[in-house]
Interface confidence: low
C-alpha cells in the first residue's frame, strides 16, 4: 500500500494526503486538556481510473457502473491513534488512546 | 458501528449500502474460474454533517475546513473476502481468499 503526500503548493490534483493541524482551543473544545493541537492531516483530490484504489472491489463497481454509484472518492485508508487527556461527561479526567485521529495514508475507495 | 441498507426502490438519499451483483463473465474476466458471479454491494448517498461518520477525525476536518477538503464521502467501512478460483499470470490455477471483495457496511469518512 502506498499513498501520495502533498502540501498547499502541490500541483497534484489526484488523491493525496495534505497536512492539517487541528487546534482544539480554536474549536472551543475546552474539555480536551492535552494535546491542545495535533497534526491530523486530511485527504483531498481526484480519484482517477484505478489510481490508488485500495480494494479490487472499487474497480469492479466502476466496471459495473450501477445507478447512483459516484465513483471512488479520496478517503483515509490508514489511520493512527493519539493519546489524549480529557474530561469525560462526568467531569472525570481520562487519559486514553483515541483511535483514528491521524490520517497516515489516503486512497481511493 | 452501524450502516444503512437500501435497494433500488429506496427513497433514502443518505449514505447507504446497495445490492450489486458482479458478473465476471460480462466483464470478459475469463481468468476467473469461480465464482462467475458474486454479490459485491456498493455504497452511495449523501454524507450529511456527522451522519454515519466512522472517525472523529472526519468531524474535526469538517470543523477545520481546510482548502480543498471535500467533506466526507460515502465509502465502505467494513468489507469481507470471498474465496476464488482463478488463473494467475503464469496460467496456474490458484484457489485463494481475496480480501475486500464484499461491502458489508457503508459510512461517511
Amino acid at each position: 500500500d502506498f499513498g501520495l503526500d502533498c502540501d498547499e503548493h502541490s500541483t497534484e490534483s489526484r488523491c493525496c494526503r495534505y497536512p492539517l493541524t487541528v487546534d482544539f482551543e480554536a474549536f472551543g473544545w475546552d474539555w480536551i486538556i492535552a494535546p491542545k493541537r495535533y497534526k491530523a492531516n486530511y485527504c483531498s483530490g481526484e480519484c482517477e481510473f484505478v489510481f490508488l484504489q485500495k480494494y479490487p472491489h472499487t474497480h469492479l463497481v466502476h466496471q459495473a457502473n450501477p445507478r447512483g454509484s459516484a465513483g471512488p472518492c479520496c478517503t483515509p485508508t490508514k489511520m493512527s491513534p493519539i493519546n489524549m487527556l480529557y474530561f469525560n461527561g462526568k467531569e472525570q479526567i481520562i487519559y486514553g488512546k483515541i483511535p483514528a485521529m491521524v490520517v497516515d495514508r489516503c486512497g481511493c475507495s | 458501528d452501524f450502516g444503512l441498507d437500501c435497494d433500488e426502490h429506496s427513497t433514502e438519499s443518505r449514505c447507504c449500502r446497495y445490492p450489486l451483483t458482479v458478473d465476471f463473465e460480462a466483464f470478459g474476466w475469463d481468468w476467473i474460474i469461480a465464482p462467475k458471479r458474486y454479490k459485491a454491494n456498493y455504497c452511495s448517498g449523501e454524507c450529511e454533517f456527522v451522519f454515519l461518520q466512522k472517525y472523529p477525525h472526519t468531524h474535526l476536518v469538517h470543523q477545520a475546513n481546510p482548502r480543498g477538503s471535500a467533506g466526507p464521502c460515502c465509502t465502505p467501512t467494513k468489507m469481507s473476502p470471498i474465496n476464488m478460483l482463478y488463473f494467475n499470470g503464469k496460467e496456474q490455477i490458484i484457489y485463494g481468499k481475496i480480501p475486500a471483495m464484499v461491502v458489508d457496511r457503508c459510512g461517511c469518512s
Epitope: 501520495l4 500541483t11 490534483s13 493525496c16 489510481f51 | -
Partner: antibody, heavy 124, light 107 residues
Framework: QVQLVQSGAEVKKPGASVKVSCKAS????????MHWVRQAPGQGLEWMGN????????NYNQRFKARVTMTTDTSTSTAYMELRSLRSDDTAVYYC?????????????????WGQGTLVTVSS | DIQMTQSPSSLSASVGDRVTITCKAS??????LSWFQQKPGKAPKSLIY???RLVDGVPSKFSGSGSGTDFTLTISSLQPEDFATYYC?????????FGAGTKLEIK
C-alpha cells in the same frame, strides 16, 4: 496506439469564439487528464489549463480563466477547448497533450502524447 | 507564477559536439522539471522528466540533471536530427510554466 487528433485550422474575427477539438484513441479516455498548451507564431509554449474527463474537473491558467472553457465528451473520447473574445494576439497553434503518471509522488507525470496542433488565426 | 529562465536563447554547434542548455527556476521546484524538443511545424516531444529520467524511446545521448532551481539538459555527440528548439517546463506548481526556449542551430 495512443493518438490525439485535433480539428483543422480556423480563421476568426476579433471578438469571436473558437472551439478546438481533440479526439483521443488507443487508451481509456476517462483515466487521464488532458492539458491544453498554445504557441504563438515564432514564440514559446504557454500552458492554458487541463481537464479530467472522468468528472469534468478543470484547472485553468489565471491568464485565460475569464475566456476559456475546457470540456469533454466521454461518449466520443473528445476533449474541447473554447476560447472566447478572441484578440489578434490569440493567433497561435493550440495543442492538446495527455498527462501520463509514472510514479506515486506529487507531480510525477509528463506529457507523453501530443495532438498535431490546430492553427487559430485571429484577423479582421 | 514560477518564472523559468532558459539559456542560451540560441546556440550554434557542429555535428559530434556536446552541448548543454540550462534552465533556472525562480523558486525551488524540487526535481519537477521536464525537457522537450520541438521541430518546426511539429508538436513538442518529451525527452526528460523528473529532471533526469529519460522518456521511453529517447536515445541515451540526452541527459538531464539538477534539482531545486538549477537544471541542465546535455546532448552528447550531436546528430543532424538533434537541431531543433528545446524547452524546459516546471510541473511543481500551477500554472505550469515553460522556459522561453533554446534554438539549437548547425554551425
Amino acid at each position: 496506439q495512443v493518438q490525439l487528433v485535433q480539428s483543422g485550422a480556423e480563421v476568426k474575427k476579433p471578438g469571436a469564439s473558437v472551439k478546438v477539438s481533440c479526439k483521443a484513441s488507443g487508451y481509456t479516455f476517462t483515466g487521464y487528464f488532458m492539458h491544453w498548451v498554445r504557441q504563438a507564431p515564432g514564440q514559446g509554449l504557454e500552458w492554458m489549463g487541463n481537464i479530467y474527463p472522468y468528472n469534468g474537473v478543470s484547472n485553468y491558467n489565471q491568464r485565460f480563466k475569464a475566456r476559456v472553457t475546457m470540456t469533454t465528451d466521454t461518449s466520443t473520447s473528445t476533449a474541447y477547448m473554447e476560447l472566447r473574445s478572441l484578440r489578434s494576439d490569440d493567433t497561435a497553434v493550440y495543442y492538446c497533450a495527455r498527462r501520463y503518471y509514472y510514479g506515486t509522488g506529487p507531480a510525477d507525470w509528463y506529457f507523453d502524447v501530443w495532438g498535431q496542433g490546430t492553427l487559430v488565426t485571429v484577423s479582421s | 507564477d514560477i518564472q523559468m529562465t532558459q539559456s542560451p536563447s540560441s546556440l550554434s554547434a557542429s555535428v559530434g559536439d556536446r552541448v548543454t542548455i540550462t534552465c533556472k527556476a525562480s523558486q525551488d521546484i524540487n526535481s519537477y522539471l521536464s525537457w522537450f524538443q520541438q521541430k518546426p511545424g511539429k508538436a513538442p516531444k518529451s525527452l526528460i522528466y523528473r529532471a533526469n529520467r529519460l522518456v521511453d524511446g529517447v536515445p541515451s545521448k540526452f541527459s538531464g540533471s539538477g534539482s531545486g532551481t538549477d537544471f541542465t539538459l546535455t546532448i552528447s555527440s550531436l546528430q543532424p536530427e538533434d537541431f531543433a528548439t528545446y524547452y524546459c517546463l516546471q510541473c511543481d506548481e500551477f500554472p505550469l510554466t515553460f522556459g522561453a526556449g533554446t534554438k539549437l542551430e548547425i554551425k
